[in-house]
Amino acid sequence: EEGLQVIQPDKSVSVAAGESAILHCTATSLIPVGPIQWFRGAGPGRELIYNQKEGHFPRVTTVSDLTKRNNMDFSIRIGNITPADAGTYYCVKFRKGSPDDVEFKSGAGTELSVRAKPS
Protein backbone atom coordinates (compact mmCIF):
# COMPACT_ATOMS: atom_id res chain seq x y z
CA GLU A 1 0.00 0.00 0.00
CA GLU A 2 2.92 2.33 0.71
CA GLY A 3 3.91 1.77 -2.91
CA LEU A 4 1.01 3.77 -4.33
CA GLN A 5 2.20 6.75 -6.33
CA VAL A 6 0.15 9.70 -7.55
CA ILE A 7 1.57 10.73 -10.91
CA GLN A 8 1.02 14.15 -12.43
CA PRO A 9 3.07 13.85 -15.61
CA ASP A 10 2.84 17.52 -16.62
CA LYS A 11 4.91 20.01 -14.65
CA SER A 12 3.10 22.82 -16.40
CA VAL A 13 0.17 23.42 -18.72
CA SER A 14 -0.59 26.61 -20.64
CA VAL A 15 -4.12 27.33 -21.80
CA ALA A 16 -5.72 30.28 -23.60
CA ALA A 17 -8.45 32.12 -21.70
CA GLY A 18 -11.86 30.73 -22.56
CA GLU A 19 -10.52 27.27 -23.40
CA SER A 20 -10.55 24.08 -21.31
CA ALA A 21 -7.57 22.80 -19.36
CA ILE A 22 -6.85 19.11 -18.90
CA LEU A 23 -4.84 18.26 -15.80
CA HIS A 24 -3.54 14.70 -15.85
CA CYS A 25 -3.30 12.43 -12.84
CA THR A 26 -3.01 8.68 -12.44
CA ALA A 27 -2.62 6.43 -9.43
CA THR A 28 -0.42 3.34 -9.64
CA SER A 29 -2.66 1.20 -7.43
CA LEU A 30 -6.27 0.77 -6.30
CA ILE A 31 -4.98 0.33 -2.74
CA PRO A 32 -5.55 1.96 -0.31
CA VAL A 33 -9.26 2.52 -0.81
CA GLY A 34 -10.22 6.17 -0.71
CA PRO A 35 -11.12 9.14 -2.86
CA ILE A 36 -9.08 11.51 -4.97
CA GLN A 37 -9.38 15.27 -4.53
CA TRP A 38 -7.91 18.09 -6.58
CA PHE A 39 -6.70 21.31 -4.97
CA ARG A 40 -5.26 24.57 -6.20
CA GLY A 41 -2.36 25.52 -4.00
CA ALA A 42 -0.93 23.74 -0.99
CA GLY A 43 -1.19 24.09 2.77
CA PRO A 44 -4.13 25.09 4.93
CA GLY A 45 -5.43 27.73 2.51
CA ARG A 46 -5.62 25.44 -0.51
CA GLU A 47 -8.77 25.60 -2.64
CA LEU A 48 -10.82 22.47 -3.32
CA ILE A 49 -11.36 22.10 -7.08
CA TYR A 50 -12.85 18.61 -7.28
CA ASN A 51 -13.84 15.96 -4.74
CA GLN A 52 -14.51 12.47 -6.03
CA LYS A 53 -16.51 11.60 -2.93
CA GLU A 54 -18.84 14.55 -2.50
CA GLY A 55 -20.57 17.26 -4.41
CA HIS A 56 -21.04 18.44 -7.96
CA PHE A 57 -18.47 20.76 -9.51
CA PRO A 58 -20.04 22.33 -12.60
CA ARG A 59 -16.84 23.52 -14.26
CA VAL A 60 -14.97 20.27 -13.67
CA THR A 61 -15.46 16.96 -15.44
CA THR A 62 -13.38 13.85 -15.08
CA VAL A 63 -11.66 12.64 -18.23
CA SER A 64 -12.49 9.01 -17.44
CA ASP A 65 -15.51 7.46 -15.74
CA LEU A 66 -14.71 7.27 -12.03
CA THR A 67 -17.68 5.01 -11.35
CA LYS A 68 -15.74 2.17 -13.03
CA ARG A 69 -14.43 0.08 -10.18
CA ASN A 70 -10.89 -0.42 -11.51
CA ASN A 71 -10.33 3.16 -12.67
CA MET A 72 -6.95 4.70 -11.84
CA ASP A 73 -7.12 7.76 -14.12
CA PHE A 74 -8.14 10.84 -12.14
CA SER A 75 -7.45 13.46 -14.76
CA ILE A 76 -9.85 16.40 -14.86
CA ARG A 77 -10.98 18.94 -17.42
CA ILE A 78 -11.71 22.48 -16.20
CA GLY A 79 -13.91 24.46 -18.54
CA ASN A 80 -13.89 28.14 -19.53
CA ILE A 81 -10.50 29.01 -18.06
CA THR A 82 -9.92 32.58 -16.90
CA PRO A 83 -6.73 34.27 -15.63
CA ALA A 84 -8.06 33.76 -12.08
CA ASP A 85 -7.59 29.99 -12.55
CA ALA A 86 -3.80 30.25 -12.79
CA GLY A 87 -1.90 28.38 -10.11
CA THR A 88 -0.49 25.01 -9.15
CA TYR A 89 -2.95 22.12 -9.02
CA TYR A 90 -2.41 19.04 -6.88
CA CYS A 91 -4.03 15.64 -7.28
CA VAL A 92 -4.29 14.15 -3.79
CA LYS A 93 -5.14 10.58 -2.81
CA PHE A 94 -6.98 10.08 0.48
CA ARG A 95 -7.14 6.89 2.50
CA LYS A 96 -10.59 5.86 3.72
CA GLY A 97 -10.88 6.60 7.43
CA SER A 98 -13.41 6.90 10.20
CA PRO A 99 -14.91 9.35 10.73
CA ASP A 100 -12.83 11.30 8.17
CA ASP A 101 -10.66 10.26 5.25
CA VAL A 102 -6.97 10.93 5.73
CA GLU A 103 -4.64 12.50 3.18
CA PHE A 104 -2.37 9.74 1.92
CA LYS A 105 -0.27 10.95 -0.99
CA SER A 106 -0.08 13.97 -3.27
CA GLY A 107 1.07 14.36 -6.81
CA ALA A 108 3.94 16.74 -7.53
CA GLY A 109 1.62 19.41 -8.89
CA THR A 110 0.88 20.92 -12.30
CA GLU A 111 1.27 24.64 -12.83
CA LEU A 112 -1.54 26.10 -14.93
CA SER A 113 -0.77 29.33 -16.74
CA VAL A 114 -3.38 31.26 -18.69
CA ARG A 115 -2.59 33.00 -21.95
CA ALA A 116 -4.55 35.97 -23.20
CA LYS A 117 -7.40 35.09 -25.54
CA PRO A 118 -6.14 35.33 -29.13
CA SER A 119 -7.58 38.43 -30.79
Epitope: K53, E54, H56, P58, L66, T67, S98, P99
Partner: antibody, heavy 120, light 107 residues
Protein backbone atom coordinates in the same frame (compact mmCIF):
# COMPACT_ATOMS: atom_id res chain seq x y z
CA UNK B 1 -26.44 -7.60 4.16
CA UNK B 2 -27.34 -4.06 3.15
CA UNK B 3 -30.67 -2.90 4.57
CA UNK B 4 -32.50 0.41 4.28
CA UNK B 5 -35.76 0.68 6.20
CA UNK B 6 -37.98 3.75 5.85
CA UNK B 7 -40.52 4.81 8.45
CA UNK B 8 -42.66 7.80 9.37
CA UNK B 9 -45.16 7.76 6.53
CA UNK B 10 -48.88 8.15 7.02
CA UNK B 11 -51.91 10.28 6.26
CA UNK B 12 -51.54 14.01 6.84
CA UNK B 13 -53.59 17.09 6.02
CA UNK B 14 -52.40 19.67 3.48
CA UNK B 15 -50.16 22.30 5.07
CA UNK B 16 -49.01 19.98 7.85
CA UNK B 17 -45.61 18.40 8.43
CA UNK B 18 -44.16 14.90 8.51
CA UNK B 19 -40.70 13.53 9.20
CA UNK B 20 -39.47 10.44 7.41
CA UNK B 21 -36.60 8.32 8.68
CA UNK B 22 -34.41 5.73 6.99
CA UNK B 23 -32.45 3.29 9.15
CA UNK B 24 -29.35 1.88 7.46
CA UNK B 25 -27.45 -1.28 8.33
CA UNK B 26 -25.03 -3.74 6.77
CA UNK B 27 -22.61 -1.14 5.38
CA UNK B 28 -20.49 1.82 6.47
CA UNK B 29 -23.17 4.50 6.36
CA UNK B 30 -20.70 7.40 6.55
CA UNK B 31 -19.08 6.33 3.26
CA UNK B 32 -22.24 6.84 1.23
CA UNK B 33 -24.24 9.70 -0.17
CA UNK B 34 -27.96 9.20 0.46
CA UNK B 35 -31.00 10.04 -1.60
CA UNK B 36 -34.76 10.33 -1.29
CA UNK B 37 -36.80 9.36 -4.34
CA UNK B 38 -40.59 9.33 -4.51
CA UNK B 39 -43.20 7.66 -6.67
CA UNK B 40 -46.74 8.97 -6.88
CA UNK B 41 -49.44 6.27 -7.26
CA UNK B 42 -49.26 4.79 -10.77
CA UNK B 43 -46.47 7.18 -11.79
CA UNK B 44 -42.72 7.10 -12.38
CA UNK B 45 -39.75 7.81 -10.14
CA UNK B 46 -38.90 11.36 -9.07
CA UNK B 47 -35.69 12.32 -7.28
CA UNK B 48 -36.46 14.50 -4.24
CA UNK B 49 -33.21 15.30 -2.44
CA UNK B 50 -29.67 14.07 -1.89
CA UNK B 51 -27.05 14.54 0.79
CA UNK B 52 -23.35 13.75 0.62
CA UNK B 53 -21.60 11.47 3.09
CA UNK B 54 -20.51 14.28 5.42
CA UNK B 55 -23.58 16.49 4.78
CA UNK B 56 -21.36 19.05 3.00
CA UNK B 57 -23.37 18.96 -0.23
CA UNK B 58 -27.16 18.97 -0.31
CA UNK B 59 -29.42 19.23 -3.35
CA UNK B 60 -33.20 19.43 -3.75
CA UNK B 61 -35.66 19.06 -6.59
CA UNK B 62 -37.33 22.37 -7.45
CA UNK B 63 -40.70 20.87 -6.52
CA UNK B 64 -39.70 20.55 -2.83
CA UNK B 65 -37.12 23.31 -2.39
CA UNK B 66 -37.90 25.47 0.64
CA UNK B 67 -40.37 22.94 2.03
CA UNK B 68 -38.34 19.76 2.53
CA UNK B 69 -35.07 19.32 4.44
CA UNK B 70 -32.78 16.32 4.10
CA UNK B 71 -30.39 15.49 6.92
CA UNK B 72 -28.41 12.58 8.31
CA UNK B 73 -26.90 11.37 11.57
CA UNK B 74 -23.85 9.25 10.83
CA UNK B 75 -23.52 8.23 14.48
CA UNK B 76 -26.98 6.66 14.35
CA UNK B 77 -26.82 5.41 10.73
CA UNK B 78 -29.99 7.35 9.94
CA UNK B 79 -31.24 9.52 7.11
CA UNK B 80 -34.15 11.95 7.53
CA UNK B 81 -36.55 13.92 5.39
CA UNK B 82 -38.43 16.74 7.12
CA UNK B 83 -41.46 17.61 5.00
CA UNK B 84 -43.27 20.87 5.74
CA UNK B 85 -46.20 22.63 4.03
CA UNK B 86 -47.30 19.36 2.49
CA UNK B 87 -49.46 19.41 -0.64
CA UNK B 88 -51.71 16.84 -2.28
CA UNK B 89 -49.11 16.41 -5.03
CA UNK B 90 -46.59 15.19 -2.42
CA UNK B 91 -48.65 12.01 -2.05
CA UNK B 92 -46.28 9.18 -2.96
CA UNK B 93 -44.21 6.26 -1.80
CA UNK B 94 -40.91 7.68 -0.52
CA UNK B 95 -37.80 5.57 -0.97
CA UNK B 96 -34.37 6.13 0.51
CA UNK B 97 -31.40 4.90 -1.47
CA UNK B 98 -27.64 4.98 -1.13
CA UNK B 99 -25.04 6.26 -3.57
CA UNK B 100 -21.36 5.39 -3.28
CA UNK B 101 -18.97 8.30 -3.38
CA UNK B 102 -19.65 11.26 -5.65
CA UNK B 103 -22.51 12.73 -7.62
CA UNK B 104 -22.04 10.53 -10.70
CA UNK B 105 -22.58 7.20 -8.96
CA UNK B 106 -25.81 5.19 -9.29
CA UNK B 107 -28.25 4.29 -6.51
CA UNK B 108 -27.25 0.71 -5.78
CA UNK B 109 -29.56 -0.16 -2.88
CA UNK B 110 -33.08 1.05 -2.09
CA UNK B 111 -35.39 0.71 0.87
CA UNK B 112 -38.87 -0.80 0.55
CA UNK B 113 -40.51 2.63 0.79
CA UNK B 114 -42.98 4.37 3.07
CA UNK B 115 -46.32 5.77 1.89
CA UNK B 116 -47.20 9.43 2.46
CA UNK B 117 -50.78 10.49 1.76
CA UNK B 118 -51.66 14.18 1.87
CA UNK B 119 -55.41 14.57 2.04
CA UNK B 120 -58.01 16.63 3.85
CA UNK C 1 -32.53 20.17 -16.43
CA UNK C 2 -31.67 17.09 -18.46
CA UNK C 3 -34.86 15.48 -19.78
CA UNK C 4 -34.88 11.73 -20.40
CA UNK C 5 -37.29 10.13 -22.86
CA UNK C 6 -37.76 6.37 -22.91
CA UNK C 7 -39.10 4.43 -25.85
CA UNK C 8 -41.40 2.63 -25.99
CA UNK C 9 -43.59 3.51 -22.99
CA UNK C 10 -44.93 -0.03 -22.96
CA UNK C 11 -44.02 -3.23 -24.71
CA UNK C 12 -45.55 -6.69 -25.03
CA UNK C 13 -43.10 -9.52 -25.58
CA UNK C 14 -42.78 -13.27 -25.22
CA UNK C 15 -40.47 -15.39 -23.11
CA UNK C 16 -37.24 -16.00 -25.04
CA UNK C 17 -37.62 -12.84 -27.13
CA UNK C 18 -34.88 -10.21 -27.45
CA UNK C 19 -36.03 -6.80 -26.23
CA UNK C 20 -34.48 -3.35 -26.59
CA UNK C 21 -35.47 -0.22 -24.66
CA UNK C 22 -34.00 3.17 -25.55
CA UNK C 23 -33.43 6.29 -23.50
CA UNK C 24 -32.70 9.66 -25.06
CA UNK C 25 -31.25 12.59 -23.13
CA UNK C 26 -31.93 16.23 -24.00
CA UNK C 27 -28.20 16.94 -23.63
CA UNK C 28 -25.07 14.86 -23.22
CA UNK C 29 -24.79 12.93 -19.96
CA UNK C 30 -21.44 11.40 -21.03
CA UNK C 31 -21.67 7.79 -19.79
CA UNK C 32 -23.52 8.58 -16.56
CA UNK C 33 -26.71 6.72 -17.41
CA UNK C 34 -28.06 3.95 -15.22
CA UNK C 35 -30.90 1.45 -15.61
CA UNK C 36 -33.28 0.13 -12.94
CA UNK C 37 -35.93 -2.57 -12.85
CA UNK C 38 -39.05 -2.21 -10.72
CA UNK C 39 -41.71 -4.84 -10.06
CA UNK C 40 -45.17 -3.89 -8.76
CA UNK C 41 -45.15 -3.01 -5.07
CA UNK C 42 -41.36 -3.32 -4.85
CA UNK C 43 -38.44 -0.92 -4.74
CA UNK C 44 -36.29 -0.31 -7.85
CA UNK C 45 -33.25 -2.49 -8.41
CA UNK C 46 -30.06 -1.34 -10.14
CA UNK C 47 -29.29 -3.37 -13.28
CA UNK C 48 -26.73 -1.41 -15.30
CA UNK C 49 -24.56 1.48 -14.17
CA UNK C 50 -22.62 4.01 -16.20
CA UNK C 51 -24.19 2.98 -19.52
CA UNK C 52 -22.72 -0.49 -19.89
CA UNK C 53 -21.60 -1.98 -16.57
CA UNK C 54 -23.54 -4.93 -15.20
CA UNK C 55 -24.29 -4.56 -11.49
CA UNK C 56 -23.12 -7.48 -9.35
CA UNK C 57 -25.65 -10.32 -9.24
CA UNK C 58 -27.58 -9.19 -12.32
CA UNK C 59 -27.97 -11.89 -15.01
CA UNK C 60 -25.78 -11.49 -18.09
CA UNK C 61 -28.80 -11.43 -20.41
CA UNK C 62 -29.07 -7.74 -19.44
CA UNK C 63 -26.72 -5.35 -21.23
CA UNK C 64 -26.45 -1.64 -21.79
CA UNK C 65 -24.78 0.58 -24.35
CA UNK C 66 -24.50 4.18 -25.44
CA UNK C 67 -22.91 7.48 -24.52
CA UNK C 68 -23.75 11.14 -24.89
CA UNK C 69 -27.48 11.36 -25.58
CA UNK C 70 -28.52 7.89 -26.80
CA UNK C 71 -28.65 4.79 -24.63
CA UNK C 72 -30.02 1.28 -24.92
CA UNK C 73 -30.97 -1.48 -22.48
CA UNK C 74 -31.15 -4.93 -24.06
CA UNK C 75 -32.50 -8.17 -22.66
CA UNK C 76 -31.14 -10.92 -24.88
CA UNK C 77 -33.67 -13.62 -24.00
CA UNK C 78 -36.65 -12.65 -21.86
CA UNK C 79 -37.33 -14.71 -18.77
CA UNK C 80 -40.66 -14.77 -16.88
CA UNK C 81 -39.12 -12.78 -14.01
CA UNK C 82 -38.09 -9.93 -16.35
CA UNK C 83 -41.63 -8.62 -16.83
CA UNK C 84 -41.48 -5.32 -14.95
CA UNK C 85 -41.05 -1.57 -15.48
CA UNK C 86 -37.62 -0.27 -16.48
CA UNK C 87 -36.28 3.23 -15.80
CA UNK C 88 -33.21 5.06 -17.03
CA UNK C 89 -31.60 7.71 -14.80
CA UNK C 90 -28.82 10.24 -15.39
CA UNK C 91 -26.26 11.39 -12.86
CA UNK C 92 -24.21 13.73 -15.00
CA UNK C 93 -25.51 16.89 -13.35
CA UNK C 94 -28.12 17.97 -10.83
CA UNK C 95 -30.99 17.51 -10.68
CA UNK C 96 -30.95 13.74 -11.05
CA UNK C 97 -33.64 12.81 -13.57
CA UNK C 98 -35.40 9.58 -14.51
CA UNK C 99 -37.06 8.50 -17.70
CA UNK C 100 -40.82 8.02 -17.57
CA UNK C 101 -40.47 4.24 -17.53
CA UNK C 102 -41.06 1.36 -19.94
CA UNK C 103 -43.58 -1.25 -18.86
CA UNK C 104 -42.67 -4.69 -20.19
CA UNK C 105 -45.66 -7.03 -20.31
CA UNK C 106 -46.17 -10.67 -21.27
CA UNK C 107 -47.61 -11.18 -24.75
Amino acid sequence: QVQLVESGGGVVQPGRSLRLSCAASGFTFSDYGMIWVRQAPGKGLEWVASISSSSSYIYYADSVKGRFTISRDNSKNRLYLQMNSLRAEDTAVYYCARRYYGFNYPFDYWGQGTMVTVSS
Amino acid sequence: DTQLTQSPSSLSASVGQRVTITCGASKSVRTYMHWYQQKPGKQPKLLIYSASNLEAGVPSRFSGSGSGTDFTLTISSLQPEDFATYYCQQSNEPPYTFGQGTKLEIK
